[in-house]
Amino acid sequence: SEVEYRAEVGQNAYLPCFYTPAAPGNLVPVCWGKGACPVFECGNVVLRTDERDVNYWTSRYWLNGDFRKGDVSLTIENVTLADSGIYCCRIQIPGIMNDEKFNLKLVIKPAKVTPAPTRQRDFTAAFPRMLTTRGHGPAETQTLGSLPDINLTQISTLANELRDSRLANDLRDSGATIRIG
């Protein structure tokens, strides 16, 4: 049986999809849709790229990898049980019937009930996707406390406070990408 990709309610899901651009920057349109790949295009499109950039996306769906190098893997934020199912990644290679189609099965597991850590407070509402790691593994949004105004000095301070948290090792080992907004 084909493998399934997994995520837990409330976490992000990551669905892999890769192609090799003919030359660096020589991109091919890609679409992601909910449901198996139809004969043409994607059904229920959630994200689309063209030859240059992401030109359509819906809330909670984004590309975390370097899509200019052919990494068009999909991130679905804050998944619910309703996000379970088949997703289509379609690499729209020019020419008749040249498209590469990938159907990926996503399984959502119920959230585990665990006591809230005492040192962490909710931060994501004010600053969604602000601190994410890149490199070895999945992007992880860290919840650090409500700060209405933030600057690089504060981010540095926050990173220090992260030493004992779940993300600390990834920040050290993978390096961090800081994204605002």
């Epitope: 493998v3 990551y14 070895h136 080992d173």
Partner: antibody, heavy 120, light 107 residues
């Protein structure tokens, strides 16, 4: 840096249960699946199974379902594989390996391997 | 189970040669194919993921191509440090499976 440190070589009698450990460091232990693999001398690699350290959910290769039991101890970031009723066929090098991207089913970091010898 | 067939089983080369290793799947696996290098008495090391995508820290001389059932790992100029075993692995279907490997040795 990301590291997986496995327990040392073991010599066991046939039928005596054996446990191999794999201590993870340098990353968030519960954020990536951990896989176990078998390699017999001069042979290829076999995937035994995997465990999700966040909730201990496992998936085993059917070939090993009566042979291997996978567990984790989150407090020490350590994974364990227990092999039941070992025979000479179980003599091999066993590896733990971290999933390349949470749950994408390739292996980007490997332990150094644990040599198991089953002999009377 | 998906069977991965690697060829040749052994390849004898001279440093500086260009090398291509083949991996063929018993059924279509899209591009869910990954390549590993294993030197003697060492653990395997990931070289290429998803058929053609490079891995941070791996020399750029390694490249992969293919999709569906036929895949190739190439390197443009073999060095002595490249000798060892090369394995392909599929992540399309359970159970995850590996090829038997290609041994790259000095001619």
């Amino acid at each position: 840096q990301v590291q997986l440190q496995q327990s040392g070589p073991q010599l066991v009698r046939p039928g005596a249960s054996v446990q191999i450990s794999c201590k993870a460091s340098g990353y968030s232990f519960t954020s990536y699946l951990l896989h176990w693999l078998k390699q017999r001398p001069g042979q290829g690699l076999e995937w035994i199974g995997m465990i999700d350290p966040s909730d201990s959910e496992t998936r085993l290769n059917q070939k090993f379902k009566d042979k291997a039991t996978l567990t984790v101890d989150k407090s020490s970031s350590t994974a364990y594989m227990q092999l039941s009723s070992p025979t000479s066929e179980d003599s091999a090098v066993y590896y733990c390996a971290r999933d390349g991207y949470y749950a994408w089913y390739y292996f980007d970091c490997w332990g150094q391997g644990t040599t198991l010898t089953v002999s009377s | 189970d998906i069977v991965l067939t690697q060829s040749p089983a052994t390849l004898s080369v001279t440093p500086g040669d260009r090398v291509s290793l083949s991996c063929r799947a018993s059924q279509s696996i899209g591009n869910n194919l990954h390549w590993y290098q294993q030197k003697s008495h060492e653990s395997p090391r990931l070289l290429i993921k998803y058929a053609s995508h490079s891995i941070s820290g791996i020399p750029s001389k390694f490249s992969g191509t293919g999709s569906g059932t036929d895949f190739t790992l190439s390197f443009n100029s073999v060095e002595t440090e490249d000798f060892g075993m090369y394995f392909c692995q599929q992540s399309n279907s359970w159970p995850l499976t590996f090829g038997a490997g290609t041994k790259l040795e000095l001619k």
